[in-house]
Amino acid sequence: IWELKKDVYVVELDWYPDAPGEMVVLTCDTPEEDGITWTLDQSSEVLGSGKTLTIQVKEFGDAGQYTCHKGGEVLSHSLLLLHKKEDGIWSTDILKDQKEPKNKTFLRCEAKNYSGRFTCWWLTTISTDLTFSVKSSRGSSDPQGVTCGAATLSAERVRGDNKEYEYSVECQEDSACPAAEESLPIEVMVDAVHKLKYENYTSSFFIRDIIKPDPPKNLQLKPLKNSRQVEVSWEYPDTWSTPHSYFSLTFCVQVQGKSKREKKDRVFTDKTSATVICRKNASISVRAQDRYYSSSWSEWASVPCS
Amino acid sequence: RAVPGGSSPAWTQCQQLSQKLCTLAWSAHPLVGHMDLREEGDEETTNDVPHIQCGDGCDPQGLRDNSQFCLQRIHQGLIFYEKLLGSDIFTGEPSLLPDSPVGQLHASLLGLSQLLQPEGHHWETQQIPSLSPSQPWQRLLLRFKILRSLQAFVAVAARVFAHGAATLSP
């Protein structure tokens, strides 16, 4: 058993049929010694008396808010949560496996630049009685500070018969060094509590590996005289690291119709303009990627050919 | 060339060669991103490699103030990786695929380090750690980790030279 936060404790249980469970001793936080009784949740049934209460925790019915009283007055609470371990593996019932970029990916994180700011998100089908707490650091043995905000519900989607909820959190490294080569990964830890179930999820990454620039901005077209060609120009996204002579991007320019199966024109460039062939009912799209490190491409920025 | 007196390197040449190094490092190990190497006890293998750190003057301001500190750091790293790529880790079993770009990568590391340091002048170089994995699978894992680390190192070096070519060239 360990303390998650003040008056909230996590009991780690090996979860299998007829498991013996864990013996837990609760102590009432009071100077009083006599006349103390214990109850669980809303029940008025007295579970025991005395300053300490010893219980055998085997299942969710044994978890909950234990309260010690004296003469009708509440002295203190202890909330017990269960963390299940099945076949040596901690349960992951609360969050959905996003399966990208690999199986057992529960947390996904992205950064728009090298400033040390990043966003992580996760998915669940659970809509109520759910809380998240996020901590982060650079490195684990001698951790350096990363400050995370509160996790918030950022999207709701319908998937078949189920509703899916997306939560996200923003974090910022306290002393980020955008130009340095990272040697220690960022660690992100999410505590998830659903009713009386506790689970924790972790992710470890370098900012460079989760970079995904915003799409290029201000796409403009200029038809070339006596030609089918069009000069397309754009700018670096505002959110990208500066100076651009140091933090350079490379671009992919594509002309394509509505269907992916349609024919297309495509060219890669390090510049912020390119010449392509525009077709009626087609769109010109541009996306960006770090020039020197193969992290994710941005989403496409598009303008119609006409 | 970065010479003892502190004169400028051939920024444009260094830029071209460092960008080539980036391309080669990724073609030497393109799928490395799909393998979570941090789960494999990374510390003892890659803690010893020279990283370009915050105080090394490789940021735009540091380069403007005095690029020599940064260039020396990059040079150390190039020599270090060049030695690693020529070591038993890469030459031993399992043999590299004949079409592996590691050979080109090795030669390009040497080429860039020579651009940075003319004959007769020697910056101090970092000792190579004795990483001699006994098992072929350990060697394979170590290669992945070294290439992964090299990708990050040459990306920073390429940024330095691109910025230098754009803003510090005479």
Epitope: R228, Q229, T250, K263, K264, V267, D270 | -
Partner: antibody, heavy 118, light 107 residues
């Protein structure tokens, strides 16, 4: 499968014109860009131009502008390349080539030998 | 127009050996570079597109690398059917241009 079949060899006199055909099968002609590339005997490849069979848009290399005409007949799934004012240095194998991507060549015809000789 | 230069013009290699072919552009072309193989009396065949992307049906012994102005086609272990002429082609800008070719012959 996607195939391009070209017309047979031609012998032409200097100053004349030649029209080479290229019949597409295994796909709809308008789904691919179509290019013409030539190769003089013992020499390398030289790009001449492209046509979008969907709308008839064409673009040719500056060297051939005013002398080459590329057309398509979608009813017969055939593309044509006409080269006018032939000179002896136009002696070459002329290839049609197609792709869904405009700038490189995925499928090639077998080639048509055009000999220009007086 | 962009001039593509291939080297060497002829490469003599023994079967089973590795062949490295070079292609240089007169200006930076990012990764807009494609490789073709041509055997005598046949049309060219696309091997690699956008510098390093492999084509289904092309043996894995063919690989490409490079960006900017310098590109390489590597044939890891030459088979008898690989003796041919290889061309690079840039697609950075029109007119599309080819290199002069590298003939890979039996040593």
């Amino acid at each position: 499968q996607v195939q391009l079949v070209q017309s047979g060899a031609e012998v032409k006199k200097p100053g004349a014109s030649v029209k080479v055909s290229c019949k597409a099968s295994g796909y709809t002609l308008t789904d691919y860009y179509l290019h013409w590339v030539r190769q003089a005997p013992g020499q390398g490849l030289e790009w001449m131009g492209w046509i979008d069979p969907e709308n008839g848009d064409t673009e040719s290399a500056p060297k051939f502008q005013g002398r080459v005409t590329m057309t398509t007949d979608t009813s017969t799934s055939t593309a044509y390349m006409e080269l006018r004012s032939l000179r002896s240095d136009d002696t070459a194998v002329y290839y049609c080539a197609a792709n869904k991507e405009l700038r490189y060549f995925d499928v090639w015809g077998q080639g048509t030998m055009v000999t220009v000789s007086s | 127009e962009i001039v593509m230069t291939q080297s060497p013009a002829t490469l003599s290699v023994s079967p089973g050996e590795r062949a490295t072919l070079s292609c240089r552009a007169s200006q930076s072309i990012s990764i807009n570079l494609h490789w073709y193989q041509q055997k005598p009396g046949q049309a060219p065949r696309l091997l690699i597109y956008f510098a390093s992307q492999s084509i289904s049906g092309i043996p894995a012994r063919f690989s490409g690398s490079g960006s900017g102005t310098e590109f390489t086609l590597t044939i890891s272990s030459l088979q008898s059917e690989d003796f041919a002429v290889y061309y690079c082609q840039q697609s950075n800008s029109f007119p599309l241009t080819f290199g002069g070719g590298t003939k890979v012959e039996i040593k």
